[in-house]
Amino acid sequence: ECVTQLLKDTCFEGGDITTVFTPSAKYCQVVCTYHPRCLLFTFTAESPSEDPTRWFTCVLKDSVTETLPRVNRTAAISGYSFKQCSHQISACNKDIYVDLDMKGINYNSSVAKSAQECQERCTDDVHCHFFTYATRQFPSLEHRNICLLKHTQTGTPTRITKLDKVVSGFSLKSCALSNLACIRDIFPNTVFADSNIDSVMAPDAFVCGRICTHHPGCLFFTFFSQEWPKESQRNLCLLKTSESGLPSTRIKKSKALSGFSLQSCRHSIPVFCHSSFYHDTDFLGEELDIVAAKSHEACQKLCTNAVRCQFFTYTPAQASCNEGKGKCYLKLSSNGSPTKILHGRGGISGYTLRLCKMDNECTTKIKPRIVGGTASVRGEWPWQVTLHTTSPTQRHLCGGSIIGNQWILTAAHCFYGVESPKILRVYSGILNQSEIKEDTSFFGVQEIIIHDQYKMAESGYDIALLKLETTVNYTDSQRPICLPSKGDRNVIYTDCWVTGWGYRKLRDKIQNTLQKAKIPLVTNEECQKRYRGHKITHKMICAGYREGGKDACKGDSGGPLSCKHNEVWHLVGITSWGEGCAQRERPGVYTNVVEYVDWILEKTQAV
């Protein structure tokens, strides 16, 4: 059962796993949610009746029954983890805590103009978990405006104390706001020879990389595959760090793989969700339950629905035994990973999908697409919406993309003559315009947010957000697309598609069926040569064939330029402008979405 509210002046008795320090009960709940075993917590707020050494303690708790006895205690705030909830979860914490000093290892000290600048510095520093900033009112003159970057083994403070005229806060890496590089490559036959901060068992290098990503201290990893010569080290995932943030030594070793934390790309690829099945593989761990199940998929479902289950092993039924049902072993461990991995015993193993809700919805794999042809099929581009105006009569105005359950990203120039959001309708999950009838459900628009610096499409800033009046329930036919990570600025996208209901030639009409075209990206240098009278800025991105023939056109405006990278679709561009349509040596010009990620997050995460 999902319980989100906090219980004031209440303490849960027993069940302690560990104690951490957090600046608020709200953040204690987030820490509990991300901890592999925590189901409940008790936080102690600052209070004259409490011993100051106990202020800000966050006691993480577990219970076989998923609840614990409650005791009244002043200043105690208790609650449940969000593991039991189905809603999207985020570790992003933008709060600034006034007059609190969050203790940790102070590894960097510098002058900053503001707490915001200090927080940005922390977000863009590979080691930083949180910071404390001494304001200009701080009593000690030499410490004023000093920004202390801090880290700890757990990613949370080792202690929190009251201190006048300082402010503290956390890195915004988990808010997708870091400019650090996103290195997705996994390097085969490579060992990183730096210090290990932890080690866990993992079935493959991808799971190892994802574990590294949400481990607070891990910057890179080395994984020993099941063919690794030393048997005791097979399937071992070594979580590593270094002072520089990069591996100091790379050793060539067969059957080992190495890679980097995906911290700076976590909003555009799954880092919590281990959805694969591992055949002929047994995961060992503490047994939670043994249940009969028809298949390994059914076993995974059972594990996902059991809040304490972290991973499972399914042993298929022996012929005609137990109505064809096999045994499903639901398991857990102290760190969420198997204590040992065995091969050759015929089991099928995997992980709970409960953690998938900690990943961005946009990373969910969508139905395989039918390549070739220009008409799309249903569910092929589930983020694509058609934006209609109802004034003076109803018609398709522009395309747009679902980027959140209340947000559509589109182009600013679409709103020429639109004097009120009341005349707009957003239709999602649509393949053919002819599906839209009087009674077709739509999303009303609460607010149109146009970039302040937009003047005309050709000079850039051609970007707008629509805040919907109601939230979108994600399904196979309507779901969000990932924004590109700022750390992905140097990625070369090779699988890009433009979609829309726009014209198929310059003098035409809106198409009934959603059209698609695969279009290669063009460098800004090349694009600038094709548009000598314009300034093609880094905030624009171009796509097109040298010979022309395929392009976006009138009516496609505001729609997505979607690029697939590492099996995840990213909203790389917004259809903006171009000379004619599909002309030779005249690529289409798109708004370069990665350059507006900060703007998008600022507007969509505003309180």
Epitope: H413, F415, Y416, E419, I450, D452, Q453, Y454, W577
Partner: antibody, heavy 118, light 112 residues
């Protein structure tokens, strides 16, 4: 409701600077663009320039060397200055608000007549 | 700068009859973003101008449906299906595709 009101001296001497203020209400200058348009007596409309909502300005090329548009967002005012005026600058001066984008002009002030004469 | 030429400059019409005003541009008004930033304004005697149409043919709310617009590229037309006495005034086309923005010289519609 949305209102724009032009104000300023009705008479300006040749070679002096014409100064007008457009005071707005019912909307923010950081959300909408404001244009200046003029109309000499018995003649057509002439676009003078725009104060974009981000504070940038853009002017009619024939007036560019003489015109300055500025704003004071705290007072909800946009100002027009036209230097070195001649009798040809005698006109009714309008301020108008752009739409969600630059245009169309969805709201207009009632206009103020400025006569250039010694 | 873009020059907009309106014809006729004066248009006497009998009430109930149709009327048509042409606006020709010195260069195409089709923007590279797909929009055509061509608008029509009416200035009634002693009043400020008011917008009738934007994007060639789109009526703003409150504008009677007897007003319609058509055209593309450089040639545009405003049509009034049946002129009424309240339609008297000066009609201006206006372009915002190319800076600096420009008005046509105006067409005076009067009742015969």
């Amino acid at each position: 409701q949305v209102q724009l009101q032009e104000s300023g001296p009705g008479l300006v001497k040749p070679s002096e600077t014409l100064s007008l203020t457009c005071t707005v209400s019912g909307f923010s200058l950081t959300t909408y663009h404001v244009h200046w348009v003029r109309q000499p007596p018995g003649k057509g409309l002439e676009w003078i320039g725009i104060m974009w909502r981000d504070g940038d300005t853009y002017y009619n090329s024939s007036l560019k060397s003489r015109v300055t548009i500025s704003r004071d967002t705290s007072k909800n005012q946009v100002s027009l200055k036209l230097s070195s005026v001649t009798a040809a600058d005698t006109a009714v001066y309008f301020c108008a608000r752009g739409g969600t984008l630059t245009t169309p002009f969805t709201y207009w002030g009632q206009g103020t007549l400025v006569t250039v004469s010694s | 700068d873009v020059v907009l030429t309106q014809t006729p400059l004066s248009l006497p019409v009998t009430p109930g009859e149709p009327a048509s005003i042409s606006c020709r541009s010195s260069q195409s008004l089709e923007s590279r973003d797909g929009n055509t930033y061509l608008e029509w304004y009416l200035q009634k005697p002693g009043q400020s101008p008011q917008v009738l149409l934007y994007g060639v043919s789109n009526r703003l709310s409150g504008v009677p449906d007897r007003f319609s617009g058509s055209g593309s590229g450089t040639d545009f037309t405003l049509k009034i299906s049946r002129v009424e006495a309240e339609d008297v005034g000066v009609y201006y086309c206006f372009q915002a595709t190319h800076g600096p923005f420009t008005f046509g010289q105006g067409t005076k519609l009067e009742i015969k």
